[in-house]
């Protein structure tokens, strides 16, 4: 009769390299008596026997991943136990290799001379592919204007006529090369403003003349916009000389406003426009002179430029002497505070703050701001910024204000309108477009599963709300 023998792994696991959609096998040869029970883990999480993505054979000694996916990267371990002596373990890594793939190829671009052009070229692959660009038949050389970004996109500052042509991106790693289709960059010379109107700070009831000159072929027409609407009062005088149009708008000032000069000319079936704006503010703007609490205008600041919808009208609160500067200063201060928060919280908090300070605006007899939807506010507070909010509330209770989010002009979620009341009466936050690498785990989430297993919520898992490890009321 055989003597009992503790398990010994005679073939330790090794690092396995595998291409996406190929088969990967780990071998864990074990000698023991009686026959051991062999279990397998990935990143310390048990692989279930009935998981159809895996095949476990040879009494558990052979683990096969039937079709390797990008997300299968990790440390795989076999654990053998037969009740004699202790369990033994051997671990090895799976490195998923992938030929280059262009996931977001460049597209045809028409661009006005002098602007910035970005041709996207997002790639996948392991090892990470290097991206280069070809213009015409030649490799494109980078210079002070032309750069290939970390993402693979091609950025051309201050586009010139000679930048026009056919481009393609090339993604290359040790496993192969991928080419995008040829795309065309067209450089157009459209209407251009030579002299923008100047901002004025005047007394109530003053006359102001705003002047705007523009050039283009054909000669542009100039129109004026006041707080997002066609100018309702004032007189306009125009003159044209040598393809330059000069427009003068004379106004009688009874309220502050944002005045935009729009130069337009036609190219085939398309119109091109150039805009320049000036503010007319009123010195010692008293409450009696206000006909509403604010006005609608395009956001012209910098801090929230990437967060707010392009060309959207936002609400400026005239309880500030200079609403646009005051609100921009508030958000600028908030932005500096956000440097202290986690990468998970920051984009969500930025979206919340920008949309709270610069609320979408419906112009009309009384300009009306559109607050954030309550549910989005709650998701930012309880999901994305749970730790920060917990810390902030703790500091508030103890009278301590050092860092984090305490200075931020944050909304009170419970006072915001719900999407159920009227889905069109509140703003939904665009904080959801997270890049995969930006989220690894939600903080302070109470779950029976290990936090390392909480992913960035891609296809295989889900978040319909959150359970942070503290209570919000």
């Amino acid at each position: 009769e055989k003597l009992p023998k503790a398990p010994v792994i005679t073939t330790p696991l090794e690092t396995v390299d595998a291409l996406v959609e190929e088969v990967a096998t780990f071998m864990c040869a074990v000698e023991s008596y009686p026959q051991p029970e062999i279990s397998w883990t990935r990143n310390k999480i048990l692989i279930k026997l009935f998981d159809t993505r895996y095949s476990i054979r040879e009494n558990g000694q052979l683990l096969t991943i039937l079709s390797v996916e990008d997300s299968d990267d990790g440390i795989y371990c076999c654990i053998a136990n037969n009740g004699v002596g202790g369990a033994v373990e051997s671990c090895g890594a799976l490195q998923v290799k992938m030929k280059p793939k262009i996931t977001r190829p460049p597209i045809n671009v028409k661009i006005i001379e002098g602007l910035k052009a970005v041709l996207p070229c997002t790639t996948m692959g392991n090892p990470k592919p290097s991206v280069s660009w070809i213009k015409g038949d030649n490799a494109l050389r980078e210079n002070s204007r032309i750069a290939v970004l970390e993402s693979g996109s091609l950025r051309i500052h201050n586009v010139q006529k000679e930048d026009a042509g056919q481009y393609r991106c090339v993604a290359k790693n040790s496993l192969g090369t991928a080419y995008s289709k040829l795309v065309k960059l067209e450089v157009e010379v459209f209407a251009r403003i030579l002299r923008a109107p100047e901002s004025h700070n005047v007394t109530f009831g003053s006359f102001v003349t705003l002047r705007c000159t523009a050039i283009g072929i054909p000669v542009p027409t100039i129109s004026w916009i006041e707080n997002g609407n066609a100018v309702s009062s004032g007189s306009i005088q125009e003159s044209v000389k040598d393809r330059v149009i000069d427009s003068r708008l004379q106004l009688f000032i009874t309220k502050p406003g944002l005045y935009t000069c729009i130069a337009t000319n036609k190219h085939g079936e398309k119109f091109s426009t150039a805009k320049a704006a000036a503010t007319v503010s009123i010195a010692e703007w008293s409450k009696s002179q206000k006909d509403s609490q604010g006005y609608c205008a395009q956001y012209r600041g910098e801090v929230c430029d990437a967060v707010l919808a392009k060309d959207a009208l936002v609400f400026f609160n005239t309880s500030y002497r200079d609403p646009e500067d005051a609100q921009e200063l508030l958000i600028h201060t908030a932005w500096n505070e956000l440097k202290a928060v986690s990468p998970l919280c920051r984009p969500a908090a930025e979206a919340l703050l920008c949309n709270h300070l610069f609320q979408e605006c419906s112009p009309g007899v009384v300009p009306t701001p559109m607050p954030i939807c309550r549910e989005y506010c709650l998701a930012v507070k309880e999901l994305f910024c749970a730790k920060e909010w917990q810390a902030m509330e703790g500091k508030a209770h103890r009278g301590l204000y050092r860092s984090g989010m305490h200075l931020l002009p944050v909304p009170e979620c419970s006072k915001l309108p719900s999407m159920h009341r009227d889905p069109t009466a509140c703003t939904r936050l665009p904080y959801l477009d997270y890049k995969k690498e930006n989220i690894t785990t939600f903080p302070s989430i109470t779950s029976s599963r290990p936090s390392a297993d909480i992913p960035n919520l891609p296809a295989s898992t889900s978040s319909f709300a959150v359970s942070p490890a503290y209570s919000m009321t």
Epitope: L378, F442, A459, S460, S462, S463, A465, S467, P468
Partner: antibody, heavy 124, light 107 residues
Amino acid sequence: EVQLVESGGGLVQPGGSLRLSCAASGFTVSSSSIHWVRQAPGKGLEWVASISSSYGSTSYADSVKGRFTISADTSKNTAYLQMNSLRAEDTAVYYCARSEGDRYVSGYMGMDYWGQGTLVTVSS
Amino acid sequence: DIQMTQSPSSLSASVGDRVTITCRASQSVSSAVAWYQQKPGKAPKLLIYSASSLYSGVPSRFSGSRSGTDFTLTISSLQPEDFATYYCQQSGVWLITFGQGTKVEIK
């Protein structure tokens, strides 16, 4: 008017499969989260699975994980529940329900519209 | 996993009574808690969402509140049509959990 209509229920033997459909009208599946909730005869409500199709994110109750698959076809504005390896304890009325918004906010919205339910009986 | 313990499992009350149903979460949760009413042979109906918000079309005698991990549904003055089974439900990162239900019967 928002409506959810389930179909595909019926009698099936243990180990068998069924595919339930949930046809939505009056809203788009792509901008909502869809949930399957079941109720065994004389018992309470039990959540089965959810999908937020704008992100393709899905989640399942432990009792059905590995056996059931939730999916959505946004072109048909329909959600599905593929049920394999059915057991006697899966016998229930299966409801589909929606909650408004993406996967981050739908939990705050509650399941505001429900279908009439479809009966699944697992028996030999 | 988070459990929602609902109490009582059943209660008898008269028209005009004030009724309170409680759900206790087994650990701290967000305010993503909803309450539903279900009548025999019918699908559940949403009453309260986000712990305390009244769903449109639901009578104002229904209200929801929270205190830490305790969530409460209150019917301020019970009406004949309110006799039904009530469920709480919480939405978490990993799963959705329903309470076991409270049957409100006529005394």
